[in-house]
């Protein structure tokens, strides 16, 4: 199942995807498409790279802002709208026979929440990120609130909370 990423309307969405160039600097073509990964390449391509640089972008809202030359091909969609919601395919086109790495991720764009008085930390984390960490490998995903987060300490929660606030996005798996 796809990992879900949540962004508010008007914010930037960040969809992670990466690979390790081997040897370093030996880049491979990558495509991002709207819709699940098809049999080959990407459908409804929004951005494409070649062995050197981004060579195709369907809109100025799509960017690779990470260190592309180190294999960070995470997609940033600027100023998202509800229409940007859906599954995206990141395909790392490693040369060879049926060698590609395929990653489907789901973007959920939500309307901005109304401003309310800040609740307690426990309630804030639970309501803001109710499905932040879930188990998607074995059957239906199971919600885990911060009270039952496995192997996560408060420092990690604070760090993650701040990062998510900065990016305007949250993460969950479906």
């Amino acid at each position: 199942s796809e990992v879900e990423y949540i962004a508010e309307v008007g914010q930037n969405a960040y969809l992670p995807c990466s690979y390790t160039p081997a040897p370093p600097g030996n880049l491979v073509p990558v495509c991002w498409g709207k819709g699940a990964c098809p049999v080959f390449d990407c459908s409804n391509v929004v951005l494409r790279t070649d062995n050197r640089d981004v060579n195709d972008r369907t809109s100025g809202r799509y960017w690779l802002k990470g260190d592309f030359h180190k294999g960070d091909v995470s997609l940033t969609i600027e100023n998202v709208t509800l229409a940007d919601s859906g599954v995206y395919c990141c395909r790392i086109q490693i040369p060879g026979i049926m060698n590609d790495e395929k990653h489907n991720v789901k973007l959920v764009v939500i309307k901005p929440a109304k401003v309310t008085p800040a609740p307690t930390l426990q309630r804030d984390l639970t309501s803001a990120f109710p499905r932040m960490l879930t188990t998607g490998e074995h059957g239906p995903a199971e919600t885990q609130t911060p009270g039952s987060l496995p192997d996560v300490n408060l420092t990690q929660i604070f760090t993650l909370t701040n990062e998510l606030r900065d990016s305007g996005a949250t993460i969950r798996t479906a």
Epitope: A36, P38, V39, D41, S43, N44
Partner: antibody
Framework: EVQLLESGGGLVQPGGSLRLSCAAS????????MSWVRQAPGKGLEWVSA????????YYADSVKGRFTISRDNSKNTLYLQMNSLRAEDTAVYYC????????????WGQGTLVTVSS | EIVLTQSPGTLSLSPGERATLSCRAS???????LAWYQQKPGQAPRLLIY???SRATGIPDRFSGSGSGTDFTLTISRLEPEDFAVYYC?????????FGQGTKVEIK
């Protein structure tokens, strides 16, 4: 106008080899994925193989994997299919086809070349 | 692999009538990655529909596609003499690419 012209078909004995060519014109060849699709006499369509615009990525049907090799020469605007260890069940019309700019389906097809595998 | 089953095998209709062709997949076709082709005797196939419902360039609007998941339909609203042919569906959501066995639309 997009044109695809296949050649290289013919009669070959089981276990033999054949190389099909497809000369393309009317579009920027190196920008598009290309595919081979075959059709046995009186039967339906069967996808055989596909190759990316650069030639770096290739895909094959299980029925031909390890026996057929797809390649392309972008300087000559030509697509190839090298067929080895041919079997009677490979007898078919082989079509060269251009993938749509949004790949995985085929918007232009050649007229096909007949490959007959028989002793 | 995804098996596509087309029905009926043969459709006997008269010019001017409506044709409804079905394509059923053995498992869900992701993102409606389904195309339809037309093939006349002795000719190469011709792309009609992709993405389940988008008409290819130059295809008359009497051809329309619909459906999602496992059930897809090609509709020809009013058959013209040149529409009598074999029609194939093809999925491209799951490896390998696969085609249905075809539906023949013949003159009644």
């Amino acid at each position: 106008e997009v044109q695809l012209l296949e050649s290289g078909g013919g009669l070959v004995q089981p276990g033999g080899s054949l190389r099909l060519s497809c000369a393309a014109s009317g579009f920027t060849f190196s920008n598009y994925w290309m595919s081979w699709v075959r059709q046995a006499p009186g039967k339906g369509l069967e996808w055989v193989s596909a190759i990316s615009g650069s030639g770096g990525s290739t895909y094959y049907a299980d029925s031909v994997k390890g026996r057929f090799t797809i390649s392309r020469d972008n300087s000559k605007n030509t697509l190839y299919l090298q067929m080895n260890s041919l079997r009677a069940e490979d007898t078919a019309v082989y079509y060269c086809a251009k993938d749509h700019w949004d790949p995985n389906f085929l918007d232009y097809w050649g007229q096909g070349t007949l490959v007959t595998v028989s002793s | 692999e995804i098996v596509l089953t087309q029905s009926p095998g043969t459709l006997s209709l008269s010019p001017g009538e409506r044709a409804t062709l079905s394509c059923r997949a053995s498992q869900s076709v992701s993102s409606s990655y389904l195309a339809w082709y037309q093939q006349k005797p002795g000719q190469a196939p011709r792309l009609l529909i992709y993405g389940a419902s988008s008409r290819a360039t130059g295809i008359p609007d009497r051809f329309s596609g619909s459906g999602s998941g496992t059930d897809f339909t090609l509709t020809i609203s009013r058959l013209e003499p040149e529409d009598f042919a074999v029609y194939y569906c093809q999925q491209y959501g799951s490896s390998p690419l696969t085609f249905g066995q075809g539906t023949k639309v013949e003159i009644k």
